[in-house]
């Protein structure tokens, strides 16, 4: 047979679907690997072929499209399960070919079990919403294409295991769920269950979104350096250990890259001959504000080290800040006691 462009196993698309629910899976070739769509390929005389490898097996086998009630079917570039079964888990391959051309890609499909409270091994999308912002809407995800627009499905929303009825600031509106002036207590998993009829049968789609309430853009600030500060003097004798924490608060900013670094006499620690250790730790508030601490330590400080200029720097998308540590040798004049 002719050579086939094999894109391998596309692990970027680890598709998870719930057991006993409909699933429609598009062949990734047309979305991510080829420059043309299915219609163009089909009109050019190319055929789309599906096959699969069961979980924990090596043998590729054709998909059985002759199951009762057309449980598995193909429509254009979509593989349909109506509904899925647990043992449908495996690696699925779609191959586009004719006598002179061939291209294929495989992808993993995992059929996941859920309990009555929608707990499962499913990875849920995370929707971040700003605290105290006026109105946030989330939409029941990944339900397009399951039923025609003429069908009006019933939609029930849950927070965790509890149906959302008379929640004071959360309002179900069909496929949408609206949050009014959200608070941290609105954090959690929100599940929509969409029920629709097809050929005399009722199908259910279960979709869960994790809501995380985060700091508002109106509260976003440049970094704030808590330590070092002008009130604390690091007074040491040669031979002692010098430990200076650089503690910086970053308000939550969507997609911000928060940075903290030290300079010694204007140079990065890697560029100086001093034997310096830097350890970093990060903690988060309930609204994902970040406190980042970089501890600079010199095991046995020398008189020269005590004359150097130690500066903590911080940067986010709102701006930069810097603060020098007050370091001096013990006995060199009167100063306030060191407090850490």
């Amino acid at each position: 047979s002719e050579r086939c462009d094999d894109w391998g196993l596309d692990t970027m698309r680890q598709i998870q679907v719930f057991e006993d629910e409909p699933a429609r899976i598009k062949c990734p070739l047309f979305e991510h690997f080829l420059k043309y769509n299915y219609s163009t390929a089909h009109s050019s005389g190319l055929t789309l072929i599906w096959y699969w490898t069961r979980q924990d097996r090596d043998l590729e086998e054709p998909i059985n499209f002759r199951l009762p009630e057309n449980r598995i079917s193909k429509e254009k570039d979509v593989l349909w399960f109506r509904p899925t079964l647990l043992n449908d888990t495996g690696n699925y391959t779609c191959m586009l070919r004719n006598t002179t051309y061939c291209s294929k890609v495989a992808f993993p499909l995992e059929v996941v079990q859920k309990d009555s409270c929608f707990n499962s091994a499913m990875r849920f999308p995370v929707h971040k919403m700003y605290i105290e912002h006026g109105i946030h809407k989330i939409t029941c995800p990944n339900v397009d294409g399951y039923f025609p627009s003429s069908v009006k499905p019933s939609v029930t929303w849950y927070k965790g295991c509890t149906e959302i009825v008379d929640f004071h600031n959360v309002l179900p509106e069909g496929m949408n769920l609206s949050f009014f002036i959200p608070l941290v207590s609105n954090n959690g998993n929100y599940t929509c269950v969409v029920t629709y009829p097809e050929n005399g049968r009722l199908f259910h789609l279960t979709r869960t979104v994790t809501v995380k309430v985060v700091g508002s853009p109106k509260d976003a600030l440049p970094p704030q350096i808590y330590s070092p500060n002008d009130r604390v003097v690091y007074e040491k004798e040669p031979g002692e250990e010098l430990v200076i924490p650089c503690k910086v608060y970053f308000s939550f900013i969507m997609d911000s890259h928060n940075e903290v670094w030290w300079t010694i006499d204007g140079k990065k620690p890697d560029d100086v001959t001093v034997d310096i250790t830097i350890n970093e730790s990060v903690s988060y508030s309930s609204t994902e504000d970040e406190t980042r601490t970089q501890i600079l330590s010199i095991k046995k400080v020398t008189p020269e080290d005590l004359r150097r200029n130690y500066v903590c720097h911080a940067r986010n998308t709102k701006g930069e800040a810097e603060q020098a540590a007050k370091v001096k040798q013990k006995g060199n004049g009167c100063t306030e006691p060191m407090t850490l």
């Epitope: 912002h133 006026g134 109105i135 004071h168 002036i181 608070l183 941290v184 207590s185």
Partner: antibody, heavy 118, light 107 residues
């Protein structure tokens, strides 16, 4: 200095309407959620309504839902409460309060008395 | 909605004595609890937020403790100006709700 000054209270008949105003100063009004809280004579405090800092999100106590409307004009640093279909049980001192998700109501106005009586 | 219950309804204390006020939530409010003081004819004043943090300008004799569903406001040594009604309030969930109040009166 943060100041909140309510006005618009008075005597009104059952079924009538009243519009309360709260003039804010001493802080960036447009950056805060604002609320109305009321206190019936000799009784405790009851949150009535809240509005988001930009004015697009509103919430109401069940006791006033459908009758009261909260709004704000950030250009005038003013909070409003439109009260319709007033009942005797709406008689109270109405306070406007700055609302913070991390500290509750940190500043209050002096209040304005609304009396609903025939 | 979350129901806040304060006890006792009235507390009779002599000046200089300690006063302990309790507040219970019908479900967890984490540490999202505030205490207010209200004197006759005046608006409430924020004393404590985050269950235990004193608001600006509040004397150190006022302290708050607790988390979840059980909270306490302690006034370590009552001054004449402390005789008032005290309210707890949760701001964890909408609607924000108040306790019915505790009146601290002179014994």
């Amino acid at each position: 200095e943060v100041q909140l000054l309510e006005s618009g209270g008075g005597l009104v008949q059952p079924g009538g309407s009243l519009r309360l105003s709260c003039a804010a100063s001493g802080f960036t009004f447009s950056a805060y959620t604002m609320s109305w809280v009321r206190q019936a004579p000799g009784k405790g405090l009851e949150w009535v309504s809240a509005i988001s800092y930009e004015g697009d999100g509103t919430l109401y106590a069940d006791s006033v839902k459908g009758r009261f409307t909260i709004s704000r004009d950030n250009s005038k640093n003013t909070l409003y409460l439109q009260m319709n279909s007033l009942r005797a049980e709406d008689t109270a001192v109405y306070y406007c309060a700055r609302s913070l998700y991390w500290s509750g109501f940190d500043y209050w106005g002096q209040g304005t008395l609304v009396t609903v009586s025939s | 909605e979350i129901v806040m219950t304060q006890s006792p309804a009235t507390l009779s204390v002599s000046p200089g004595e300690r006063a302990t006020l309790s507040c219970r939530a019908s479900q967890s409010v984490s540490s999202n609890l505030a205490w207010y003081q209200q004197k006759p004819g005046q608006a409430p004043r924020l004393l404590i937020y985050g269950a235990s943090t004193r608001a600006t300008g509040i004397p150190a004799r006022f302290s708050g403790s607790g988390s979840g569903t059980e909270f306490t406001l302690t006034i370590s040594s009552l001054q004449s100006e402390d005789f008032a009604v005290y309210y707890c309030q949760q701001y964890n969930n909408w609607p924000w709700t108040f306790g019915q109040g505790t009146k601290v009166e002179i014994k």
